[in-house]
């Protein structure tokens, strides 16, 4: 698995380099997670033909995956820094149960799946430090998450592969939208 940001050997070798700003660190963290997702998607796509699934089939799902909407204030039109930051943090917290589900879904990329999960936890911490209005952030209910995880793990093989593919795709899209929005802050 790639070395998480901040643990790069080049950082050690260049002591006179300016330390990363909070925004740069967040940017780097998101890009690191996106690289991890690409590796996981590669394994998923090599293993099954799920990646050829139509957008229509994927849209017809009963998963409640976080998604950016106009009202969240993360798009250029109607951009609102505080509202958007709350949405990003809330969305990442909601994705955590799905990232937990991914943990037993990979053979060759097992470490990579763990790295994506842990790096997301770190990203949430970075963003929480940046947020002023932490009260507006709703944390998912652990009991609800536990029963959701049980239900996802109980699915048949085809559904598990489709679910894995959709989680990775949705998480990638969510992070890409977040990255664009955070660069405006």
């Amino acid at each position: 698995a790639p070395v998480p940001p901040g643990e790069d050997s080049k950082d050690v070798a260049a002591p006179h380099r300016q330390p990363l700003t909070s925004s740069e660190r967040i940017d780097k963290q998101i890009r690191y997670i996106l690289d991890g997702i690409s590796a996981l998607r590669k394994e998923t796509c090599n293993k099954s033909n799920m990646c050829e699934s139509s957008k229509e089939a994927l849209a017809e799902n009963n998963l409640n995956l976080p998604k950016m909407a106009e009202k969240d204030g993360c798009f250029q039109s109607g951009f609102n820094e505080e509202t958007c930051l709350v949405k990003i943090i809330t969305g990442l917290l909601e994705f955590e149960v799905y990232l937990e589900y991914l943990q037993n879904r990979f053979e060759s990329s097992e470490e990579q799946a763990r790295a994506v999960q842990m790096s997301t936890k770190v990203l949430i911490q970075f963003l929480q430090k940046k947020a002023k209005n932490l009260d507006a952030i709703t944390t998912p209910d652990p009991t609800t998450n536990a029963s959701l995880l049980t239900k996802l793990q109980a699915q048949n093989q085809w559904l598990q592969d489709m679910t894995t593919h959709l989680i990775l795709r949705s998480f990638k899209e969510f992070l890409q939208s977040s990255l664009r929005a955070l660069r405006q802050m």
Epitope: S53, E60, F106, E107, K151, Q153, Q155, N156, Q157, W158
Partner: antibody, heavy 119, light 111 residues
Framework: EVKFEESGGGLVQPGGSMKLSCVAS????????MNWVRQSPEKGLEWVAE??????????YYAESVKGRFTISRDDSKSSVYLQMNNLRAEDTGIYYC??????????WGQGTLVTVSS | DIVLTQSPASLAVSLGQRATISCRAS??????????MNWFQQKPGQPPKLLIY???NQGSGVPARFSGSGSGTDFSLNIHPMEEDDSAMYFC?????????FGGGTKLEIK
């Protein structure tokens, strides 16, 4: 052709133990999730247990009625799945089928083996 | 657990006529546009034989007179035209998630 052959059934007293075996052929056994399903006139068809192999990790599931008493296991080198049944009760009586749930939800069955729990 | 309610419990149909058996699930057995509902036929002393899987796909070697339809929570098995050999027990089963569950069965007879 997909085939399953169950064995190990018979008559056993309440509280007793019994081990069922199932040998599969005609498909790549190690890739599939194996199940035991039973049938009785009283309860109809009832799923009992499943053993999955996902990304080299086993996951095992049991029906609530058999949890703590039954143990499912598999030996991929022998294309076999087993059901160890302990502390048997009269309500465990029935025909036990070995079944494989294929990727798309298609279920294959064996011929079944009769288990009778009676004193 | 997903509960499957089958109806009717028994049915008598004349040769050449249509037999329709229904199965209702307590929650959706579908996702990503596919419904994980299977139908089985069982004759005395034999294991269940798969007729239909994923709601409408025919099992191998199953005659065309057997067809399945439905999505979400409501499904049906149609047999048309009814033949002598179709007299048997019929079961629905969901393979969406553990625990795999079955309907109570429908006894189909010749009128």
């Amino acid at each position: 052709e997909v085939k399953f052959e169950e064995s190990g059934g018979g008559l056993v007293q309440p509280g007793g133990s019994m081990k069922l075996s199932c040998v599969a052929s005609g498909f790549s056994f190690s890739n599939y999730w194996m199940n035991w399903v039973r049938q009785s006139p009283e309860k109809g068809l009832e799923w009992v247990a499943e053993i999955r192999l996902t990304s080299n990790k086993q996951a095992i599931y049991y029906a609530e009625s058999v949890k703590g008493r039954f143990t499912i296991s598999r030996d991929d080198s022998k294309s076999s799945v087993y059901l160890q049944m302990n502390n048997l009760r009269a309500e465990d009586t029935g025909i036990y089928y070995c079944a494989s749930l294929f990727y798309d939800g298609y279920l294959h069955w064996g011929q079944g083996t009769l288990v009778t729990v009676s004193s | 657990d997903i509960v499957l309610t089958q109806s009717p419990a028994s049915l008598a149909v004349s040769l050449g006529q249509r037999a329709t058996i229904s199965c209702r699930a307590s929650e959706s057995v579908g996702n990503f546009g596919i419904s994980f509902m299977n139908w089985f036929q069982q004759k005395p002393g034999q294991p269940p034989k798969l007729l239909i899987y994923t709601a409408s796909n025919q099992g191998s070697g199953v005659p065309a007179r057997f067809s399945g339809s439905g999505s979400g929570t409501d499904f049906s098995l149609n047999i048309h035209p009814m033949e002598e050999d179709d007299s048997a027990m019929y079961f629905c089963q969901q393979s969406k998630e553990i625990p795999w569950t079955f309907g109570g069965g429908t006894k189909l007879e010749i009128k």
